[in-house]
Interface confidence: low
């Protein structure tokens, strides 16, 4: 249904002539113009008090009639000040004024909190032309109202450049209380205190707020809204809601989980994704992070040699990317390994443990008491070593590595030989007369390259000469062997 | 337990502006309204405004809007009231005062903790 | 703005007797909080939602009322009961009025 404000009732009539409140059967509008339509009416309305100082603002025309009577300042009539209707109800609100007949072309706005109001709006303005002045009725619907049509409402009209404001209509909608605030999940630590928000408007006001935990009411009597729900703790997972009471009734928020902070349940799937020598490169999948962000992992490593102290390293990391190298391991080694992550209540279990191996190391020592000589009559160097004393982790032996340099005036030439791991001499070409050759030798595995030993040098003279004497490693303290043939 | 802290005491020249402090501690600031009471020598309370610090959001005593400002810094859980353009008439004990926050606001508790007041006096 | 109106705004009662003073307010409140203060000193909550004592109030203290009319009662006037009474209200929207208090003196 919709309820009509209407002017109130005045001791004097509202326009010359029969038309509203007066308007008789046979009496029609000679032009009724209809705004873009799209809103509907209905409603109640308390009305502004009689007397009441006009706020509306007066044109006063400089014009005069025929006999030379000034013209009455022109202003709206009062109408109703403040309607007060329920949600979805129609509403349907004028204003009017009379205007004297030698003004052309006047039309009616209407506004909104002080914006036009264009476009889906149902306006409609209807004239009542008298003998000296046209009544004009401008009127203003909405089918279904809601909490935005909330405002003061104006009517404008321009004549001779001025701008006539009629007096404020104010709608207020009623309706359920509406959440402007709402409980929110969280994730807490066992019997710890938190606070819920719950808050809701009207109109109509006062809202009143009942808090329910686990569908039973937490609060006996209501609380106006906003409302402040301090729960003291809790030891078990619990679901949380407000209601929202008004004159119009009740509205219930969404419910909230409150989520009780736990250890995290421990990583799994931790896997192997790369092993050298002395590295391991593992990842994992977090387990349940227990309603708190993880902090950090712990990587545990253990030697999976029965003979082995049984000793635990301990890595730390960051919680993400879930990855990680676990450095300064032995070659050819076996090892358990675990993951734990913590969040702020603690750590969680240890993952299962996996075993994961590393790969054979390069030889950790140089071959030993190297010895170079001349052997002029097939111009050829000899070279011999013993072999290093290898750990079981350094890998079997495969050959060595020889690397000999040739200096003589103005030219270097590094040449690089390998040998097999059975030997421990070898013979390479002279490449260069009358010049130095120094020799380093590398013990050689599948895992690498060891270290060379400490260089021995020995001069190769001119083709002619024919003393010569082996040349090898040198003592201790001696730091540039050199012998001369 | 909580505290309200307030600023010494101010003598100003009319016309002047004052800022005057309220340090709070032993609960979240942030979460509680903070309001301002003037009470002028052998008179009574009169409220002037309040702010939630959370959100900077207030509410005056209209009269009030305007001579008085109030603002909070979270970081330090300090509410501050500055009150503009002083006349003979602003010569008072400024109180700041806030609820108790345990299951209601303080609309439903009233001003549980109250500041120790700040004297302001205005003299040419 | 709701405007409260105490009553009477100076009083005297001796040791022993029954004290009781008023609140008026000019429109209906939805909650009224009485405060207790001594010269020289901030105020103290007395009574808060009409007619919960606040911590460490004696129980000689008692408040009553709703809609627009409230009271504070003491059953047995004492010497430390002496003070100025404020009642304070609170609608559903600031602004929060203040009485103009009771001065309640020891005779």
């Known amino acids: 249904a919709i309820t009509e404000a209407r002017e109130e009732a005045k001791p004097y009539p509202l326009f010359p002539g029969p038309f509203p409140g007066s308007l008789q059967t046979d009496h029609t509008p000679l032009l009724s113009l209809p705004h873009a339509s799209g809103y509907q009416p209905a409603l109640m309305f308390s009305p502004t008090q009689p007397g009441r100082p006009h706020t509306g603002n007066v044109a006063i025309p400089q014009v005069t009639s025929v006999e030379s009577k000034p013209l009455p300042p022109l202003a709206f009539k009062h109408t109703v000040g403040h309607i007060i209707l329920s949600e979805h109800k129609g509403v349907k609100f004028n204003c009017s004024i009379s205007v004297p007949n030698i003004y052309q072309d006047t039309t009616i706005s209407w506004w909104k909190d002080g914006k036009e109001l264009l476009g889906a709006h149902h306006a409609i303005t209807q004239f009542y032309p008298d003998d000296e002045v046209t009544a004009i009725i401008a009127s203003f619907s909405i089918t279904s109202v809601q909490r935005s049509d909330n405002g003061s409402y104006i009517c404008k009209m321009k004549i001779n450049n001025e701008e006539i404001v009629s007096d404020p209509i104010y709608i207020e909608v009623q309706g359920l209380p509406h959440f402007t605030k709402q409980p929110e999940s969280m994730n807490v630590t066992r019997n710890t205190a938190f606070n819920l928000t719950c808050q809701a408007v009207g109109p109509p006001e006062p809202v009143n707020i009942f808090w329910v935990q686990n569908s039973s009411r937490v609060n006996e009597q209501p609380e106006k809204s906003p409302s402040v729900l301090t729960v003291p703790g809790l030891t078990e997972m619990a679901v949380f809601s407000c209601e929202a009471h008004n004159d119009k009734g009740l509205t219930v928020s969404k419910g909230v989980q409150i989520n009780i902070k736990a250890i995290p349940s421990p990583p799994t799937e931790v896997s192997i994704r790369n092993s050298t020598a002395h590295s391991i490169l593992i990842s994992w999948v977090p387990g349940f992070d227990g309603y708190s962000p993880f902090r950090n992992c712990s990587i545990q490593v253990k030697e999976a040699d029965p003979l082995s102290n049984g000793s635990v390293m301990i890595f730390n990391t960051s919680a993400l990317p879930h990855l990680y190298q676990i450095k300064q391991l032995q070659a050819l080694a076996n090892y358990s390994i675990g993951v734990s992550c913590m969040n702020e209540i603690g750590w969680s279990a240890v993952s299962p443990w996996i075993l994961a191996s590393t790969t054979e190391g390069a030889p950790s020592v140089a071959p030993l008491n190297v010895t170079v000589f001349l052997n002029e009559s097939s111009d050829n160097v000899d070279i011999r070593w013993m072999k290093p004393p290898t750990k079981q982790q350094d890998g079997e032996l495969v050959g060595y590595r020889i690397s000999h340099v040739w200096q003589s005036a103005g030219i270097s030439k590094e040449l690089l030989e390998e040998v097999g791991q059975n030997g421990s001499r070898a013979r390479i070409s002279v490449q260069v007369h009358n010049a130095t050759c120094t020799v380093r030798i590398a013990a050689v595995t599948r895992g690498g390259v060891g270290p060379f030993s400490d260089p021995v040098k020995i001069f190769i003279p001119a083709h002619g000469w024919v003393d010569y004497a082996p040349s090898s490693t040198p003592a201790p303290g001696n730091a540039d062997p050199v012998l001369i043939i | 337990q909580v505290q309200l802290q307030q600023s010494g005491p101010e003598l100003v020249k009319p016309g002047a502006s004052v800022k005057i402090s309220c340090k709070a501690s032993g609960y979240e600031f942030s979460r509680s309204w903070m309001n301002w009471v003037k009470q002028r020598p052998g008179k009574g309370l009169e409220w002037i405004g309040r702010?939630?610090?959370?959100?900077?959001?207030?509410n005056y005593k209209g009269k009030l809007k305007g001579q008085a400002t109030l603002t909070a810094d979270k970081s330090s859980s300090t509410a501050y009231m500055q009150l503009s353009s002083l006349t003979f008439e602003d010569s008072a004990v400024y109180f700041c005062?806030?609820?108790?926050?345990?299951?209601?606001?303080?609309?439903?508790?009233?001003?549980?903790?109250w500041g120790q007041g700040t004297v302001v006096t205005v003299s040419a | 703005q709701i405007v409260l109106t105490q009553s009477p705004a100076i009083m005297s009662a001796s040791p022993g007797e029954e004290v009781t003073m008023t609140c008026s307010a000019s429109s209906s409140v939805s909650y009224m909080h009485w405060y207790q203060q001594k010269s020289g000193t901030s105020p103290k909550r007395w009574i808060y939602?009409?007619?919960k004592l606040a911590s460490g109030v004696s129980g000689r203290f008692s408040g009553s009322g709703s809609g627009t009319s409230y009271s504070l009662t003491i059953s047995s006037m004492e010497a430390e009961d002496a003070a100025t009474y404020y009642c304070q209200q609170w609608s559903s929207n600031p602004p929060i009025t203040f009485g103009a208090g009771t001065k309640l003196e020891l005779k």
């Open positions: 939602d009409t007619s």
């Open positions: 005062a806030r609820g108790g926050g345990y299951y209601y606001d303080s609309r439903y508790e009233g001003f549980v903790y």
């Open positions: 702010i939630y610090p959370g959100d900077g959001d207030t």
